[in-house]
């Protein structure tokens, strides 16, 4: 008959890391339905009275919403139609961090799916020459890491040597207190070779290369989320 | 497009109060936060607080907390904004604007044209 | 409550020139900063609002960057027009804050 809620429609989760201080998405996906003025889409944390976010009728309902995302979500309401619950959240803090669900109502019928939301901090490390040490150096940087990661240096030319003995890494704490700027100085390098700076967490993992040969230097680097659905 | 169109400018006796309007076209007035703002020459502008037309909901700076009064009319698509026992100080331009964002709280991104209130006996 | 301390709070600048505006927020860390150009008569207009992204129909010569507690903005290839006072708002948290406003004058 497909009655509203006498079936099962299929809805995905994507787990996701939100960058505090920055906006994150939780991302949520489900069996289009063009009639907009049917569909239901209700956020949920788990421990939290109150919902997240809703959104019916064709816009949002904040009547049962929790203070603490007050003013701080929104649906792309624009994307409901075909299929898209992603939730956009302002401001991500520590707090923010646990299990959420993502209920669906539709003239098809109804799901839900959870997804597990972690919080901290990441960001691209950039790798420049050190010219001022007495030995050819490189120094790896990065802005804003939460919780405290590690860092690995590895070469091309002598894959699988350890570095740990040739290079320094130090945490500065951020003037907000929560968040650390890391800085890698690794030692004694050689030209016309490839070094990576590897910062990692248990929410993000951010590489660094760079190539020093007579004639240039380049780099590249890239950050990836773990976990990532 | 959007436009906030803003009540005139008035002249108010100290102790009494004032109610200026805020009337938005362009867009789904209950969808998005109007936060409200006043602006004194040499003083740059100050947040007063924002309303959520949708809800009623409101947050306030706590300096301005029983002094302004933020409410929303649905029907008609206008924010209020009533200001009690004025002062001297109380004698400068208000501005409204829509919130980006929808229900999320963003940026300032239209404003109205200001509603300019002198508190003088 | 977050205070955003803006700086200078007025400056001359040539035509075709270039000048760069900086807030600093007390407290707190996030992306969550926009700038305004406010002309006598008129009302603001949002420039640049999340540190760096430029409203629509915004120039280019228009510019903001930042990160943590320290912002800032920039205009390059001054024209005539951009004679005005330029505000930076502080839009991530509870309560909003403004910065104290710079006044530009172009030469």
């Known amino acids: 008959f497909g009655i509203s809620g006498k079936h099962f429609i299929t809805v995905t989760t994507f787990t996701s890391a939100g960058n505090i201080g920055e906006d994150g998405t939780l991302s949520c996906t489900f069996e289009p339905d063009i009639k907009l003025n049917g569909i239901v889409i209700q956020w949920l944390k788990e421990g939290i009275k109150g919902l997240v976010h809703e959104f019916k009728e064709g816009k949002d309902d904040l009547s049962q919403q929790h203070e603490m995302f007050r003013g701080r979500t929104a649906v792309f309401a624009d994307q409901v139609v075909v299929g898209n619950a992603s939730l956009r959240l302002k401001n991500v803090q520590l707090t923010d961090a646990g299990t959420y669900t993502c209920y669906i109502r539709t003239s098809k019928g109804k799901g839900n799916a959870n997804l597990e939301y972690k919080t901290g901090a990441f960001s691209m490390p950039e790798i420049n020459v050190d010219y001022n040490a007495s030995s050819e150096s490189l120094r790896c940087e990065a802005p804003r890491w939460f919780p405290q990661p590690t860092v690995a240096w590895a070469s091309q030319v002598d894959q699988g040597a350890n570095f740990s003995e040739v290079s320094n890494t130090s945490f500065e704490l951020n003037s907000e207190n929560v968040t650390m700027k890391v800085v890698s100085v690794l030692y004694n390098v050689t030209i016309n070779n490839t070094y990576s700076c590897m910062i990692e967490n248990d929410i993000a993992k951010a590489t660094g290369d760079i190539k020093v040969t007579d004639s240039e230097v380049k780099r590249r680097s890239q950050l990836q989320l773990l976990n990532s659905g | 497009q959007v436009q906030l169109q803003q009540s005139g400018a008035e002249l108010v006796r100290p102790g009494t109060s004032v109610k200026m309007s805020c009337k938005a076209s362009g867009y789904t007035f209950t969808s998005y936060w109007i936060g409200w703002a006043k602006q004194r020459p040499g003083h740059g502008f100050e947040w007063i607080g924002d309303?959520?037309?949708?809800?009623?909901?409101?947050n306030y700076n706590e300096k301005f907390k029983g002094k302004a009064t933020l409410t929303a009319d649905k029907s008609s698509s206008t924010a209020y904004m009533q200001f009690s026992s004025l002062t001297s100080e109380d004698s400068a331009i208000y501005y409204c604007a829509r919130l980006d964002g929808s229900s999320y709280r963003g940026a300032m991104d239209s404003w109205g044209q200001g509603t300019s209130i002198t508190v003088s006996s | 409550d977050i205070q955003m301390t803006q700086s200078p709070s007025s400056l001359s600048a040539s035509l075709g020139g270039k000048v760069t505006i900086t807030c600093k927020a007390s407290?707190?860390?996030?992306?969550?900063v926009a700038w305004y150009q406010h002309k006598p008569g008129q009302c603001p207009r949002l420039l640049i609002h999340?540190?760096?992204t430029l409203q629509p129909g915004i120039p280019a010569r228009f510019s903001g960057s930042g990160s943590g507690r320290d912002y800032s903005f920039s205009i390059s290839n001054l024209e005539p027009e951009d004679s005005a006072t330029y505000f930076c708002?502080?839009?991530?948290?509870?309560?909003?804050?403004f910065g104290g406003g710079t006044k530009l004058e172009i030469k």
């Open positions: 309303i959520y037309p949708g809800g009623g909901y409101t």
């Open positions: 708002l502080q839009y991530g948290n509870l309560l909003y804050a």
């Open positions: 407290q707190g860390f996030n992306k969550y």
């Open positions: 999340y540190t760096s």
